[in-house]
């Protein structure tokens, strides 16, 4: 049994990361292996992760950890039984994946603007609870071309369209996602999306 | 919200027994080390013991080494401290503190031992 | 043992005037990427002592923005920027090298 594709990490910078890897060959990841992991402080001992399947050679491990700072260092060892496979480490604050927004709503009762609003991933008390920014992919469920995307760099969670701006009387869904610039991180997942019918009222042409 | 609780101190004869105790809630208390630490009236603070979180390690100070007896039980969430023969110079209030990133994140109210003829 | 020698041992301070406490160890506390194994603990008259910074410069979860700590080395500082009625105490410097944990005698911070 040997490692094909090492582990990676990343962190949401609060309570959890998620490692993955291949193996290079079917592997059954909950019983054969497992991935011990250890704060480099004192006094800190190694926990256990057991892996869950990805794909028939692929696995991926839940590791449970505080909040982060940018002083912790994790030592990664995986297990085959007595065997290790392999060694490494990782900085949870280098390797950022932020939570995905929640909560999206789309408010369609402001005259003829749209008000989409979702909710910060983070508690206040969490470092990138101030420093997120969010790109909103809005799209119609008819038009396939008719994708776009809103870069929403300001901090407050919304961001108000024109009704106009898109077509009128017909559905489209929209969806969020969010990253932080001061740690580098990698976009967040998209939030799941919503859907509503969008109609406004045609200006009156004058001729 | 993480609370200790420590219990067990009192008055105590030289060369007498105690055992303290420290009860946890609000955070997972296996994944975490825990420590003793103890301040005599009027004087500073002084680290004892520490047990990691399984229970497998455990550390003392020198002084300690032999008289006292750290340990845990993590079906409980109590760690708990025997203290052996004791001495006049032992009397304190004994604190419980949770570990991270190797100080004491959060700490308990603290327990009194006084020993005294 | 690594011994912690805080000082000075009483410090009358002013509100709103800063304050500054020095802790210095018998060996050095710092690693290869920047960080210090050093804590600083408040103890308030009559209460447990709580946590104001750890590994030498990160502030503790509800710490006020006023208290600050740096250094390097076997020196280090807690600085209060402006002080207020409610930051007397004993004030503890603590290492997190190695074991035994050792902290420094403490600084008592009054009002004058």
């Known amino acids: 049994m040997k490692v094909l594709q090492e582990p990676t990490c990343v962190s949401d910078y609060m309570s959890i990361s998620t490692c993955e890897w291949k193996m290079n060959g079917p592997t059954n990841c909950s019983t054969e292996l497992r991935l011990l992991y250890q704060l480099v402080f004192l006094l800190s001992e190694a926990h256990t992760c057991i892996p869950e399947n990805n794909g028939g050679a692929g696995c991926v491990c839940h590791l449970l950890m505080d909040d982060v700072v940018s002083a912790d260092n994790y030592t990664l060892d995986l297990w085959a039984g007595q065997q290790l496979l392999w060694k490494g480490s990782f900085k949870p604050s280098e390797h950022v994946k932020p939570r995905a927004p929640g909560n999206l709503t789309v408010h369609t009762n402001v005259s003829d603007t749209l008000l989409l609003t979702w909710s910060n991933p983070y508690p206040p008390d969490n470092y990138l609870y101030n420093h997120l920014t969010y790109a909103v992919n809005i799209w119609s469920e008819n038009d396939p071309a008719d994708f776009r995307i809103y870069n929403v760099t300001y901090l407050e969670p919304s961001l108000r369209i024109a009704a106009s701006t898109l077509k009128s009387g017909i559905s489209y869904r929209a969806r969020v996602r969010a990253w932080a610039q001061c740690y580098n991180t990698t976009w967040s997942e998209w939030s799941p999306s919503t859907k509503w019918h969008n109609s406004y009222r045609e200006p009156f042409e004058q001729h | 919200e993480v609370q200790l609780v420590e219990s067990g101190g009192g008055l105590v004869q030289p060369g007498g027994s105690l055992r303290l105790s420290c009860a946890a809630s609000g955070f997972t208390f296996s994944r975490y080390a825990v420590s003793w630490v103890r301040q005599a009236p009027g004087k500073g603070l002084e680290w004892v013991s520490a047990?990691?979180?399984?229970?497998?390690?455990?550390y003392y100070a020198d002084s300690f080494k032999g008289r006292f007896t750290i340990s845990r039980d993590n079906s409980k969430n109590t760690l708990y401290l025997q203290l052996n023969s004791l001495r006049a110079e032992d009397t304190a209030v004994y604190y419980c503190?949770?570990?991270?990133?190797?100080?004491?994140?959060?700490w308990g109210q603290g327990t009194l031992v006084t020993v005294s003829s | 043992d690594i011994v912690m020698t805080q000082s000075p041992l009483s410090l009358p301070v002013t509100p709103g005037e800063p304050a500054s406490i020095s802790c210095k160890s018998s060996q050095s506390l710092s690693e290869g990427q920047g960080y210090h194994r050093l804590d600083w603990y408040l103890q308030k008259p009559g209460q447990s002592p709580q946590l104001l910074i750890y590994?030498?410069?990160f502030t503790a979860k509800g710490v006020p923005d006023r208290f600050s700590g740096s250094g390097s080395g076997t020196d280090f500082t807690l600085k209060i920027s402006r002080v207020e009625a409610e930051d007397v105490g004993i004030y503890y410097c603590m290492q997190t090298l190695q074991t035994p944990l050792t902290f420094g005698g403490g600084t008592k911070v009054e009002i004058k």
């Open positions: 047990i990691g979180g399984s229970g497998g390690k455990t």
């Open positions: 590994l030498g410069s």
């Open positions: 503190a949770r570990n991270l990133r190797g100080g004491f994140w959060d």
